[in-house]
Interface confidence: low
Amino acid sequence: VPSIPLDVLSASNSSSQLIVKWNPPSLPNGNLSYYIVRWQRQPQDGYLYRHNYCSKDKIPIRKYADGTIDIEEVTENPKTEVCGGEKGPCCACPKTEAEKQAEKEEAEYRKVFENFLHNSIFVPRPERKRRDVMQVANTTMSSRSRNTTAADTYNITDPEELETEYPFFESRVDNKERTVISNLRPFTLYRIDIHSCNHEAEKLGCSASNFVFARTMPAEGADDIPGPVTWEPRPENSIFLKWPEPENPNGLILMYEIKYGSQVEDQRECVSRQEYRKYGGAKLNRLNPGNYTARIQATSLSGNGSWTDPVFFYVQAKTGYENFIH
C-alpha cells in the first residue's frame, strides 16, 4: 500500500467548483496507478441555525476574500422581530433578564460567528480509519453546539440542522495530481480526501487519506428570492406576506428583511430564519388603511441578496359600526 498523497491544496475558482492539487506519495511501494478523490459537504455550525439574527443591532457579514468578519452598523432603529403567523400585534417591552443575559453573550456570539469557518478548517479532525475506499464512508460529523437560555436563540428544530451527516461523493483520477470537483453548492465548506492507489489496490486497498477543507465561492444571485411575493389580508389592520426561499443559497439564509410603506418604503421589519421556517412568511401588524408596497431581501452567510420586485397591497379602512366601536 502506498503512503498518503502529500501537500494537498484546494482553492475555489467558482461557486460550484473546487480545484484540488497534491503531490505524489513519498513511498509509492510499487507502480502508482491512480488516486481516489472523495468529497463531503460539511454541516454548518449549529449555532448559525439557532441564533436569531434579528435580535442584534449589528449584523456580522463574512467577507469572502480574506475570511474576516465585518460588524455592520445598522443606522436605522434596531430591528424589531416581526410576528409570524397569527401571533398578534408586537410591541416593545422592557428588557427581561434573559435579554440582558443575551446582551452579555454578544461577545461570545460574535466570536462563534467569526470562528465558525476558522474552526471548521483548522481544528484537527480525527483521521478516519482505513477502509475499503470503494465502499461509501459511513462517517458521522456531530454538530458543534452550545447550551444557552438566551432570548436571542431558538430551540425550535431546523430540519437542515439535523442534516449533520452528508454522503461522500467519489471520483478517480488517473496519471495526474490535480482535479476539478464540480456540481458543488455555493459558499459551502467541503472536506476533500485523497487516497493514493498502486498496482496492488484491488487486493490490498489504497492508502489512508490526506485531506483538506475548502469553501466554494459565493454565487451571484443565489440569495435572491426566486419567485413572486404574495399577500393575504388579515384581521386587525394586518396582512401576511409570503415568499419562496432561495433554492440554493450561499451557505445558509440567516434572515429576511422587509421594507414597506404607503408613500415611501420607509419601514423595515426583520424576519428570522426560524420565524420564516415556521410560517413561510411574515405578518405586518397595525397598518393604517391605504395602499402599500413592500420588498423583501434575504441575508445569507455571504451577504445580501437582491431586493424583490415590489408587491402592492392595500389595507381597507373599517366602515360603519365596526369603525365606530374601534
Epitope: S33, Y34, Q135, V136, N138, P167, E170, S171, D174
Partner: antibody
Framework: VQLVQSGAEVKKPGASVKVSCKAS????????IHWVRQAPGQGLEWMGW????????KYAQKFQGRVTMTRDTSTSTVYMELSSLRSEDTAVYFC?????????????WGQGTLVTVSS | DIQMTQSPSSLSASVGDRVTITCRAS??????LNWYQQKPGKAPKLLIY???RLQSGVPSRFSGRGSGTDYSLTISSLQPEDFATYFC?????????FGGGTKVEIK
C-alpha cells in the same frame, strides 16, 4: 451525457452474449459503470461494476465466473459479456453510471438491451 | 447479501392522493438507500438517493425518509405522470440489491 447500448440479441442456451455501452459527454475514465439487469416483468438485479480508468471490476457473487466486463478507452465503450447462457438470463440489460450522485446511486442509464435466450 | 423487502407490491390510487411506499432492509444500511421510478419499456430514473436527497430535476412532491432498516418514499400529491413502478436499492454493501418494486396504478 449519454450512454448508448447495442441492439437486441437472440441467443441459444450455452452461448455467450456481449453487450456494449458507449459513453459520451463526460470524462469516460472518471466514473464507474454499473450493469443491472431486469427479467421480463421482474425487478432489478445488480451484476457488477467496471472502473473504465484501469478496467478494474467488481462482480456480484451470483455472476462470478460467467460475467466479464471490459472497456475500450479509445472508443469510450464498456462491454458486458455473459457466458453459458440459460433461459433465465432472458432480460433487459442496462448500463448505468453515478455521475452527479455518490457511487452507490445510478443517475445516468443506457436505454437497455434485450437479450433473449431460447432454443 | 442484504435483502430489500418492498411493500406493498402494488397499489391503486387517484390523482391528488398521498402515497407512501416502504422498504425494509435485512440489516442496517445506514441511510444508503435510493429510490427509482420506472415506466414500461424505459430505464429506471433516480428520484432520491441517500434516503432523502432529491435528485436534480425531481419534483418536490417526492420525499424520502428513514434510518436503520426501515425507509419510505412518499408522493405528497399523486400526478398523472407518477403512475409507474418504484424500486428501492441499498448502496451500503456490495452486492447492491433492489426491492421487488411497487406498481402504482390508477384507481
Amino acid at each position: 451525457v449519454q450512454l448508448v447500448q447495442s441492439g437486441a440479441e437472440v441467443k441459444k442456451p450455452g452461448a455467450s452474449v456481449k453487450v456494449s455501452c458507449k459513453a459520451s459527454g463526460y470524462t469516460f475514465t472518471s466514473y464507474y459503470i454499473h450493469w443491472v439487469r431486469q427479467a421480463p416483468g421482474q425487478g432489478l438485479e445488480w451484476m457488477g461494476w467496471i472502473w473504465p480508468g484501469d478496467g478494474s471490476t467488481k462482480y456480484a457473487q451470483k455472476f462470478q465466473g460467467r460475467v466479464t466486463m471490459t472497456r475500450d478507452t479509445s472508443t469510450s465503450t464498456v462491454y458486458m459479456e455473459l457466458s453459458s447462457l440459460r433461459s433465465e438470463d432472458t432480460a433487459v440489460y442496462f448500463c448505468a453510471s453515478p455521475m452527479i450522485t455518490p457511487n452507490y446511486a445510478m443517475d445516468y442509464w443506457g436505454q437497455g438491451t434485450l437479450v433473449t435466450v431460447s432454443s | 447479501d442484504i435483502q430489500m423487502t418492498q411493500s406493498p407490491s402494488s397499489l391503486s390510487a387517484s390523482v391528488g392522493d398521498r402515497v407512501t411506499i416502504t422498504c425494509r432492509a435485512s440489516q442496517d444500511i445506514s441511510k444508503y438507500l435510493n429510490w427509482y421510478q420506472q415506466k414500461p419499456g424505459k430505464a429506471p430514473k433516480l428520484l432520491i438517493y441517500y434516503t432523502s436527497r432529491l435528485q436534480s430535476g425531481v419534483p418536490s412532491r417526492f420525499s424520502g425518509r428513514g434510518s436503520g432498516t426501515d425507509y419510505s418514499l412518499t408522493i405528497s400529491s399523486l400526478q398523472p405522470e407518477d403512475f409507474a413502478t418504484y424500486f428501492c436499492q441499498q448502496g451500503s454493501t456490495l452486492p447492491y440489491t433492489f426491492g421487488g418494486g411497487t406498481k402504482v396504478e390508477i384507481k
